[in-house]
Amino acid sequence: SQVSQNCHNGSYEISVLMMGNSAFAEPLKNLEDAVNEGLEIVRGRLQNAGLNVTVNATFMYSDGLIHNSGDCRSSTCEGLDLLRKISNAQRMGCVLIGPSCTYSTFQMYLDTELSYPMISAGSFGLSCDYKETLTRLMSPARKLMYFLVNFWKTNDLPFKTYSWSTSYVYKNGTETEDCFWYLNALEASVSYFSHELGFKVVLRQDKEFQDILMDHNRKSNVIIMCGGPEFLYKLKGDRAVAEDIVIILVDLFNDQYFEDNVTAPDYMKNVLVLTLSPGNSLLNSSFSRNLSPTKRDFALAYLNGILLFGHMLKIFLENGENITTPKFAHAFRNLTFEGYDGPVTLDDWGDVDSTMVLLYTSVDTKKYKVLLTYDTHVNKTYPVDMSPTFTWKNSKLPNDITGRGPQ
């Protein structure tokens, strides 16, 4: 049913869904802090623009009686329950921030007349692609897929002279929410990644993964997995690995690799880590001081969601346009706004663009070094280290199929 929005006469409200089931196990208090910090910034920006309006957030908590797993598995109905609660209380804001779980976002989008914008810190799955009023502020699976296909095809860099067309994907079902949907997208038979590869097999057991590392009859030298170095170590340990194996470790929301005193453990030498370019000012900011690197990105997405709303509100108010219109609901895309840590770009479908960074372990220094970066907005690779000190032969990434001749 149509819910009246608290969104006019100089008073603009943001509805923040505080769900028990979340993409990251982040205390709701930290998310509240992030939202409140965002509100302070927005108020300042509006004031500086000469717009004398009130902006507030209403935090909508679920009762947690039914949906209490804490992760995203039981989130499908929680979002709808919260929307019902909002509807009954007639407390809908101009914009909805949350949910972060793909299941709940998909269901909410499907089952409601969305005449208001929805901003999500998460909703990584392909099922949340191309939604007209949904904005996602953490890299969705589609962006990862485009990078991987681009990288697989690359054969004109001095350190990658073979195009790849094969891969193993390790997916054992215990992944975090982001990893679950990233790997799900790679596994999906109809996805762009599957379409572009000639061979792809999903490894679901630890033993399958461990066997492949030294299997002379393996069908690919490349294994994609998702998680941190510790996750890899638990699986791989100190097992011997064939010299032409390449493990691609997707660990987007973890900036520990860039910390000065970090040394790469020996088991990371056959690994390329895919992560996001770290923010500059986050480490010392008030809202992120007590957060782990991963949770920093999650809380930052909430904060940036508030700043995005402030950006759009400012534009519409300056143009004398109504906020409670489909035009406003559909406007949260194809733009760049000033985020907490610099400019944030959203693509034509409201998904955040970012700089992905591919790291390798230098055999000389045992440090993580940047191999290349990839701008998801223009789908362009920027080589960084043209002569990497790889563990692989001739300082080149191997062919993906053992024994195949030069390309």
Epitope: P158, F159, Y382, P383, D385, M386, S387, Q407
Partner: antibody, heavy 118, light 106 residues
């Protein structure tokens, strides 16, 4: 438009050092690698090294590892190459050249002539 | 290092002629890059990734080849095409250049 403007010609005595600059404009300096290329009279072009201005990563051609030192000043969008212990065989035109992968060396500076003579 | 050998080193031709320059690599490379240089000027990117014309390069130029043999072809030579052309590889580190082919007016 993209421009790479190099410092002027230099005449140096053997054993001296010289620092050549390359000021970039018309694009984001930190987005593209910067190469240095030598062209000695009557010789083929020789690639000396490359620097990534964003991360500071530098790769040298082994042949020039002890001859050239590449640096940058990102605030001034300028790349530098210093040549040490100059000898007559270092007499050449030195070019900076930007990468726009996959088009390597897509824009070149006008060149800096370094003459080493006693 | 990969050696690149260009042939011929010198080439005399008349406007309207079809001209082919060859670049042979000492080992197989995936792509070849070409540059044009006129006297007193810096080199210009001309063809990248074997066959892609750089911005502003006329369509009478084309590039082809694979493995160790690559060619740059000018279908109908124009007065402004008289210059030296260099091939270059970045398949192996370090990148290397050919010795150049000077195209002169007959």
């Amino acid at each position: 438009e993209v421009q790479l403007v190099q410092s002027g010609a230099e005449v140096k005595k053997p054993g001296a050092s010289v620092k050549v600059s390359c000021k970039a404009s018309g694009y984001t300096f930190t987005d593209h690698n910067m190469n240095w290329v030598k062209q000695a009279p009557g010789q083929r072009l020789e690639w000396m090294g490359v620097m990534n201005p964003k991360f500071g990563t530098i790769n040298y051609n082994q042949k020039f590892k002890d001859k050239a030192t590449i640096t940058r000043d990102t605030s001034a969008s300028t790349a530098y190459m210093e040549l040490s212990s100059l000898r007559s065989e270092d007499t050449a035109v030195y070019y900076c050249a930007r990468d726009d992968y996959p088009n390597y060396f897509d824009y070149w500076g006008q060149g800096t002539t370094v003459t080493v003579s006693s | 290092d990969i050696q690149l050998t260009q042939s011929p080193s010198f080439l005399s031709a008349s406007p309207g002629d079809r001209v082919t320059i060859t670049c042979s690599a000492s080992s197989s490379v995936n792509y070849m890059y070409w540059y044009q240089q006129k006297p007193g000027s810096s080199p210009k990117s001309w063809i990248y990734r074997t066959s892609n014309l750089a911005s502003g390069v006329p369509s009478r130029f084309s590039g082809s080849g694979s493995g160790t043999e690559y060619t740059l072809t000018i279908s109908s030579l124009q007065p402004e095409d008289f210059a030296t052309y260099y091939c270059q590889q970045y398949h192996d580190y370090p990148p290397t250049f050919g010795g150049g082919t000077k195209v002169e007016i007959k």
